[in-house]
């Protein structure tokens, strides 16, 4: 996160760290807890690393440096990448992770509510992006979970800024015209959440951007509302009755 500040314990209890353990262990992506056994993240996090065994998912943590060999983590039972995601494109950058064992909810580990299907009418004015990613383009992973308040940008405006790309209706953009605040490398897959009527909703999944926090180059996020049918279909077909956090 560029231009962000430290988060507090329990402030973003749905945020998880997706880490890979090969010779060493490192944080690669963020994700959002959406049910006892489900994490929503970006499909591109698994490019070149599709093996479930190498992944460790840490939930209910604030500081990555607190992780030791004794820190509990979740393992992956199943990775479900959107069927239309292609490595050669930037579309449908969404994936579900089914955990091997369900998580108990606590003050520091609980799910984020999902938006309503095709939610286009809600005007979100209080949106935040969180993650342990770089704090500048050529930076490094941060120890303490960072947060930053970023306004949403219309798709029309976003398309103007990214003429070489196709900004689809299944994407949502956020950023300041002057730059300075944005997601960055390592924040991929993490949440863009917005507070509406006193409730936090998962509006976007951190996907891509041209550099980080550059002027007139907003961050691009997978629009979760556009994938509600897919999320429900996959979570319900996998375990019969899904326990998802949908808005009231």
């Amino acid at each position: 996160i560029v231009g962000g500040t430290n988060s507090s314990w329990g402030e973003w209890p749905w945020q998880v760290s997706l880490q890979v353990k090969l010779t060493a262990q490192r944080h690669l992506c963020g994700g959002s807890l959406i049910g006892h056994q489900w994490v929503l993240t970006a499909a591109h996090c698994f490019d070149g690393l599709p093996l479930q065994d190498v992944w460790r998912i840490y939930s209910g943590i604030l500081n990555l440096s607190d992780i030791t060999k004794d820190t509990p983590f979740s393992q992956i039972k199943e990775i479900i990448i959107h069927q239309n995601y292609k490595v050669s494109e930037g579309n449908h950058d969404i994936a579900l992770i089914k955990l091997q064992a369900p998580l108990n909810y606590t003050e520091f580990q609980k799910p984020i509510c999902l938006p309503s299907k095709g939610d286009t009418s809600t005007i979100y004015t209080n949106c935040w992006v969180t993650g342990w990613g770089f704090s500048k383009e050529k930076g490094e992973i941060q120890n303490i979970l960072q947060k930053v308040n970023i306004p949403l940008v219309t798709n029309e405006e976003c398309q103007k800024r990214y003429q070489d790309y196709k900004i689809t209706q299944r994407m949502v953009c956020a950023g300041y015209k002057e730059g300075g605040k944005d997601a960055c490398k390592g924040d991929s897959g993490g949440p863009l959440v917005c507070k509406h009527n006193g409730m936090w909703r998962l509006v976007g999944i951190t996907s891509w951007g041209e550099g980080c926090a550059r002027r007139e180059q907003p961050g691009v996020y997978t629009k979760v509302a556009e994938y509600m049918d897919w999320i429900l279909e996959k979570t319900q077909s996998s375990d019969g009755k899904a326990q998802m956090q949908s808005p009231a």
Epitope: A42, H44, D47, K86, V87, S88, E89, G90, N91, D93, G133, Q163, D164, Y165, K166, A183, C184, K185, G186, D187, S188, T206, S207, W208, G209, E210, G211, C212
Partner: antibody, heavy 125, light 108 residues
Framework: EVQLLESGGGLVQPGGSLRLSCAAS????????MTWVRQAPGKGLEWVSY????????IYADSVKGRFTISRDNSKNTLYLQMNSLRAEDTAVYYC??????????????????WGQGTLVTVSS | DIQMTQSPGTLSLSPGERATLSCRTS???????LAWYQQTPGQAPRLLIY???SRATGIPDRFSGTGYGTDFTLTISRLEPEDYGTYYC?????????FGQGTRVEIK
């Protein structure tokens, strides 16, 4: 299966014009940036131009700027290169290629993942 | 413009040998925008490596790419008869997109 098929090459006199076409199939053409690359006989590869998915944004190499125009018709899945004021140094095999733009570590990637077989343009009197 | 300099110009090696091809750029190039292509006589170029180190679909694992910033390398661990040809590096980090002049790998 992704396929790109160029046509329209041939022999043309200096100062003349030619229009190359590239018919695309096997993928959603309107989602991809497309490009032209050329190769003079016995020489290396030279990038010529690219066009955005919508066709609204185009970029050219200095060597062809003002003389060549890239365009596309997404309804026909076809890419074009209109070449005017041709010179002897424009003699080359012209390839159209698809530009893949995936995502890696929250940044976009860019590479030419599929190429046509090429069409030869000879500029000579 | 970003200049791409490949070395050596020609590499004469026997089948089974290791080939190391270098590509130097005149300015910093984001690894995501660095690719390698193979071209055999009379054929269109074929993508080998993208993002400096990711193998394209169907490319054997004897091909590997490494590098960062201004120094990139393509390695063929054990040359096979079909690997002979010309190899190009290319950047699309900034326009104009540029290719190296190529390295020809020939049979010794």
């Amino acid at each position: 299966e992704v396929q790109l098929l160029e046509s329209g090459g041939g022999l043309v006199q200096p100062g003349g014009s030619l229009r190359l076409s590239c018919a695309a199939s096997g993928f959603t053409f309107s989602h991809y940036l497309m490009t032209w690359v050329r190769q003079a006989p016995g020489k290396g590869l030279e990038w010529v131009s690219y066009i955005s998915p919508s066709g609204g944004h185009t970029i050219y190499a200095d060597s062809v700027k003002g003389r060549f125009t890239i365009s596309r018709d997404n309804s026909k899945n076809t890419l074009y290169l209109q070449m005017n004021s041709l010179r002897a140094e424009d003699t080359a095999v012209y390839y159209c290629a698809r530009v893949a733009r995936g995502i890696a570590a929250r940044s976009r990637t860019s590479y030419l993942d599929f190429w046509g077989q090429g069409t030869l343009v000879t500029v000579s009197s | 413009d970003i200049q791409m300099t490949q070395s050596p110009g020609t590499l004469s090696l026997s089948p089974g040998e290791r080939a190391t091809l270098s590509c130097r750029t005149s300015q910093f190039v984001n690894s995501n925008y660095l690719a390698w292509y193979q071209q055999t006589p009379g054929q269109a170029p074929r993508l080998l490596i993208y993002g400096a180190s990711s193998r394209a679909t169907g490319i054997p694992d004897r091909f590997s790419g490494t590098g960062y910033g201004t120094d990139f390398t393509l390695t063929i661990s054990r040359l096979e008869p079909e690997d002979y040809g010309t190899y190009y590096c290319q950047q699309s980090s900034r326009t104009p997109w540029t290719f190296g002049q190529g390295t020809r790998v020939e049979i010794k």
